[in-house]
């Protein structure tokens, strides 16, 4: 599940990883667009093991995965789901 959140919080990510994470380990991916107190786009991966990792938006693997998910979402709904949450 891919989620796009708009929040009024500052940046959430202190450290970012560029290491590939297999889909079967991922619960959901949260995208925090640039703005609202944070000057950069942030991507947070919530894993099935209950841990969370911030992913470098420039990491090749996440860009490739997002492209696959975008293509899939335009042809097959409802997975993945794009959610916009405005507090």
């Amino acid at each position: 599940v891919l989620e796009v959140y708009y929040t009024s919080l500052r940046c959430r990510c202190v450290q970012e990883s560029s290491v590939f994470i297999p889909r079967r380990f991922i619960d959901r991916i949260q995208i925090l667009p640039r703005g609202n107190g944070c000057p950069r786009k942030e991507i947070i991966v919530w894993k099935k093991n209950k841990s969370i990792v911030c992913v470098d938006p420039q990491a090749e693997w996440i860009q490739r995965m997002m492209e696959v998910l975008r293509k899939r979402s335009s042809s097959t709904l409802p997975v993945p789901v794009f959610k916009r949450k405005i507090p």
Epitope: V19, F20, F25, K48, W61, R64
Partner: antibody, heavy 120, light 107 residues
């Protein structure tokens, strides 16, 4: 120091069964996905199965899933592979491996293997 | 299943040589590729993960690159202790699959 020690291998007749064990130490076993990988004599590596910490996500090599069952006992820090209806082509060294799903996301620690020989 | 086609199956090189092994996936595996080293009678050892990241303690002469379907493993300057069989593996999706291996020998 992380240690994975396989046991339970041996000589078994075709059609027979065997249960392999993998005892883990030096890691928080209950946190990690685990896999079995095998290697036939003089051949390459073949992934057999994997299991997540809660035992609710299990995947098998399609050709083996009807005969092999992976399981674990977190209280005993142990991983198991139940092998039924064994065939000559199951003869191999069987390795257990930890799958790190925190930072590497790959099989980073391996045991030394246990040998299974299926022969009449 | 995703097939991993590794080449060459064997190669002979001299100490100090640059050695390159390639692996081709039958479909896109993103950067979900590892490289293992296996010496006779021993368990495989993880060298490279996520296509290009060196595992802890692995010498800098070992490197990996690639994404999608084409991957490369390189030893920049071959050492005698590097004599082993090397395997690529995709962990993008299950069933996890390995390449057929490359047996590396010293000339």
């Amino acid at each position: 120091e992380v240690q994975l020690v396989e046991s339970g291998g041996g000589l078994v007749q075709p059609g027979g069964s065997l249960r392999l064990s993998c005892a883990a130490s030096g890691i928080d076993f209950s946190r990690y996905w685990m896999s079995w990988v095998r290697q036939a004599p003089g051949k390459g590596l073949e992934w057999v199965a994997e299991i997540n910490p809660e035992s609710n996500f299990i995947n098998y090599a399609p050709s083996l899933k009807d005969r092999f069952t992976i399981s674990r006992d977190n209280a005993k820090n142990s991983l198991y592979l139940q092998m039924n209806s064994l065939r000559a082509e199951d003869t191999a060294v069987y390795y257990c491996a930890r799958q790190d799903d925190y930072s590497v996301y790959a099989m980073d620690y391996w045991g030394q293997g246990t040998t299974v020989t299926v022969s009449s | 299943d995703i097939q991993m086609t590794q080449s060459p199956s064997s190669l002979s090189a001299s100490v100090g040589d640059r050695v390159t092994i390639t692996c081709k996936a039958s479909q896109d595996v993103n950067t979900g590729v590892t490289w293992f080293q296996q010496k006779p009678g021993k368990a495989p050892k993880l060298l490279i993960y996520s296509a290009s990241y060196r595992y802890t303690g692995v010498p800098s002469r070992f490197s990996g690159s690639g994404s999608g379907t084409d991957f490369t493993f390189t030893i920049s300057s071959l050492q005698p202790e590097d004599i082993a069989t090397y395997y690529c593996q995709q962990y993008y999706s299950t069933p996890l699959t390995f390449g057929g291996g490359t047996k590396l020998e010293i000339k």
